[in-house]
Amino acid sequence: DAHKSEVAHRFKDLGEENFKALVLIAFAQYLQQCPFEDHVKLVNEVTEFAKTCVADESAENCDKSLHTLFGDKLCTVATLRETYGEMADCCAKQEPERNECFLQHKDDNPNLPRLVRPEVDVMCTAFHDNEETFLKKYLYEIARRHPYFYAPELLFFAKRYKAAFTECCQAADKAACLLPKLDELRDEGKASSAKQRLKCASLQKFGERAFKAWAVARLSQRFPKAEFAEVSKLVTDLTKVHTECCHGDLLECADDRADLAKYICENQDSISSKLKECCEKPLLEKSHCIAEVENDEMPADLPSLAADFVESKDVCKNYAEAKDVFLGMFLYEYARRHPDYSVVLLLRLAKTYETTLEKCCAAADPHECYAKVFDEFKPLVEEPQNLIKQNCELFEQLGEYKFQNALLVRYTKKVPQVSTPTLVEVSRNLGKVGSKCCKHPEAKRMPCAEDYLSVVLNQLCVLHEKTPVSDRVTKCCTESLVNRRPCFSALEVDETYVPKEFNAETFTFHADICTLSEKERQIKKQTALVELVKHKPKATKEQLKAVMDDFAAFVEKCCKADDKETCFAEEGKKLVAASQAALGL
């Protein structure tokens, strides 16, 4: 499917609006510090060039690859070295090394100001004054803060963002209409970004085979009536889509995602009975809907697996003939029977099966050797079941905030070298597993909880990779993708850690805490809790609870005082002294 001009091909396939949006996302994800106006200028230049290629595919430079065209354009930015330092060295390289270099410089935690939401009237005026610029600014701000955001999905978010303003800026109570919608988009956007970050990490750190295994398991759970060949085709296509998006090839990614949605909808009958509604929607909604579609009903008469994968005399022959196909079939058959298992558990089982076959198929009596392979699965299944049971009980007993605090203490003791903001962010997200998953019936808890935890722990891994401070984090993050959560769960208190020096400034609070939202106030308290554990890693739960209760009472008291600042200064000193005494600091 070779085209004379790749840029013309993608412009025609995607249309001008999507083309411009995707180029803006691509540029903002690469050059995260560039001002909005600079990016818009670059996008307009690329778009004008693309139009000349549509008019005449043989025109000068139209035959160049998208990486060459986009890379050349990014390298025209005048302040590249001042703003990005060594990233400017990428421009001395040739493709494909130049693009790889840009990819390596994507920053998961860019030093950008927090997005502050203006007043509703201000936003509505901006929306009405220049809708196009307003929506481009949204794409730009999200893309630069989330350099791995799934680009075609970001177009879907932008469409919803536009719809929210279109509806709510005409409403009687604009704020009541708009703010909940924006909150929902923000929360969904963060979740979407984190899920995609795991897909990219899977591909980039563990390779295509790891991603394909994940996709086989997940699609087999979702489409249990589909044949193995059908699932395999979907996995191949999905892998291509995500490889492209994670590699910065956003135009190809969006185009291929649209093709995949089209294929799925044209072949619903052999894929899933749950796709009908999705397939009636417009493209962006359709693709999103398919990605989130509920699991189809399992066929009623799936036989046990032992006959084909344990009892058959042909197990080693079938394995030797096509190892990955045979393991893929095992994973497919296991996953379609077990929507109640997490994808990572299914992958651990498949890995154990593979290891057993590797050993046993070289043994004198292979069948005798692998006959009890399913027994090896038992501890692997039990471990997450027990962990989820215990943690859901703890969550139900404590509620979300205190459950987060328990996890903050747990994880700070495991990896105290990690920065406090990262520990707070990650532990708060880990704690959200309770409200997200514990409400589900038991058969849905494990896939909800453990696959969500994989996403959150990947956040820890990518943030830690930027500035590595803990060998234990590096080890858990890099050894095995599917065993990350068990690896972190197994970590005990780090006995090698030298407690942090006590700094009174860390525990000095001011009246500004009183005007913060409940969430921001929680974060302040949780930051103090992490610092407390870093100073006194051997502190007991009871000691920490007593100090935190005193701290909460202190904040409440001073926020009610007439002279808040004086109260914070005087009572704060007393609290620090009392806490030091209570913890033996």
Epitope: E297, L302, S304, A306, H338, F374, F377, E382, A443
Partner: nanobody, 115 residues
Amino acid sequence: QVQLQESGGGLVQPGGSLRLSCAASGSIFTFYRMAWYRRAPGKERELVALITTDTSTNYADSVKGRFTISRDYAKNTVYLQMDSLKPEDTAAYYCNVRNVERDYWGQGTQVTVSS
């Protein structure tokens, strides 16, 4: 080793109700398919109802609208609520559960519908 404990059978008048239960123990693997079969005197064994992990259900035409199968995932237990019972429902009812390793059958519990 998996054990199945069936209970709830008995003698009931036509139009009456019974609730069968079957508790499976001894398997760490969850059963992805749990079912009830029955065998009436002098007849072949037939599937009455089945339920899968995702709570999808299938019923024999003869019991649709009268029998309801359900399961307690955590307790590895399957139930069969039998309402509007008819004399032709008289049979030995067998619990059948399936995991990735194999199928397991219960000993059976007798249901007699008679006035």
